[in-house]
């Protein structure tokens, strides 16, 4: 039985020429992780692998940074950046977990929550600051 | 360089409460994995506790779940161990030691610092 | 919980010779998905904190001498020296990190004749 959840930025709206981190947390699981995907829509942009460490996608490897930790950190950021991002963790004996982060990048100088880059940890003031809980797949 | 130093150990009674600290320097603190690990009096090595590059997750074995609490404070680079409702058994030289993200082996590990549970 | 025993608990070879030691998991500590083996080698000296030898079961840590080399699969390991210098008296634990909580082998002494 799968336990563990995913909590990810959640909904995040960024400047365009700006960057942003895009992160997940896996939780409630001693499942180990083995590798997490990042994808933009059908896209794959980085893998950071158990036994190789992160691989950024060649069409990516301008704007997209690995980290900090497991999560991805999106550069030069363009109108187009805008949509679904996931977070695949692949574990053990778990299977796969998915987390999802929408982005939407804007043209105007004022970025709803911008600075919001890392998972919410403390108190939070109102629903829309909660972490997205994931869901969980088997493999 | 790498370095863990650990401090906080001594005697305790059974039933007493001590803190670990371990500073780290020499690498990206936040950016790694960090566990205790306790080395018994027979030489025995166990692992105690665990805690994720942001604090996020923390993970115990049954001996200890309960009693000991592993947190972590990125800004100071610095990594804890509270333990409380300590028994003879607990009585060891516990180490820090670093652990690279989706690795679980420990790579670097500090001097140690020991604790003495008895009356 | 995995136990993993470690053999011979010690043993005393002569320098330049070739030492074999064993660690056995109680379950595989191979995953289907990558192919690894979840096995780390340590060496703690007297009055040393441990040190990381090998990962991956066969993987050498960098800065580790060629002479120490890790191999098995499943849960069968092996740590071998090819030729055992003076500085290499320690203790060797295998650890599986395969599935929480980890463990560790009681270790085995290696002295120098």
């Known amino acids: 039985m799968m336990t563990g959840t995913i909590e990810t930025t959640g909904n995040i709206s960024a400047e365009k020429g700006g960057s942003i981190i895009l992160q997940c947390h896996l939780s409630s699981t001693t499942a180990q992780v083995t590798q997490v995907n990042w994808e933009q829509q059908d896209q794959l942009l980085a893998i950071c692998n158990a036994d190789l460490g992160w691989h950024i996608s060649p069409s990516f490897k301008d704007r997209v940074a690995p980290g900090p930790g497991l999560g991805l950190t999106l550069q030069s950021l363009t109108v187009n950046d805008t949509g679904e991002y996931f977070c695949i963790y692949h574990t053990y004996p778990d299977g796969t977990y998915t987390g999802r982060i929408f982005l939407e990048v804007l043209e105007s100088s004022v970025a709803e929550h911008g600075a919001r880059f890392q998972i919410p940890t403390g108190d939070y003031k109102d629903d829309d600051d909660k972490p997205n809980k994931g869901s969980g797949t088997t493999s | 360089e790498v370095q863990l130093v650990e401090s906080g150990g001594g005697l305790v009674k059974p039933g007493g409460s001590l803190k670990l600290s371990c500073a780290a320097s020499?690498?990206?603190?936040?950016?790694?994995?960090m566990s205790w690990v306790r080395q018994t009096p027979e030489k025995r090595l166990e692992w105690v506790a665990y805690?994720?590059?942001?604090?996020?997750?923390?993970y115990y074995p049954d001996t200890v779940k309960g009693r000991f609490t592993i947190s972590r404070d990125n800004a100071k680079n610095t990594l804890y161990l509270q333990m409380s409702s300590l028994k003879s058994e607990d009585t060891a030289i516990y180490y820090c030691?670093?652990?690279?993200?989706?690795?679980?082996?420990?790579?670097?590990w500090g001097q140690g610092t020991t604790l003495t549970v008895s009356s | 919980d995995i136990v993993m025993s470690q053999s011979p608990s010690s043993l005393a070879v002569s320098v330049g010779e070739k030492v074999t030691m064993t660690c056995k998991s109680s379950?595989?500590?191979?995953?289907?998905?990558?192919?690894?083996?979840?096995l780390a080698w340590y060496q703690q000296k007297p009055g040393q904190s441990p040190k990381l030898l090998i990962y991956?079961?066969?993987t050498r840590e960098s800065g580790v001498p060629d002479r120490f080399t890790g191999s098995g699969s499943g849960t069968d390991f092996t740590l071998t020296i090819s030729s055992v210098k003076a500085e290499d008296l320690a203790v060797y634990y295998c650890?599986?990190?395969?599935?929480?909580?980890?463990?560790f082998g009681g270790g085995t002494k290696l002295e120098i004749k």
């Open positions: 030691a670093r652990q690279i993200l989706l690795r679980y082996y420990f790579d670097y």
């Open positions: 020499g690498f990206a603190f936040s950016d790694y994995d």
């Open positions: 805690i994720s590059d942001g604090g996020y997750n923390t």
């Open positions: 379950q595989s500590l191979l995953y289907s998905s990558n192919q690894k083996n979840y």
């Open positions: 991956w079961a066969s």
């Open positions: 650890q599986q990190y395969h599935s929480y909580p980890w463990t």
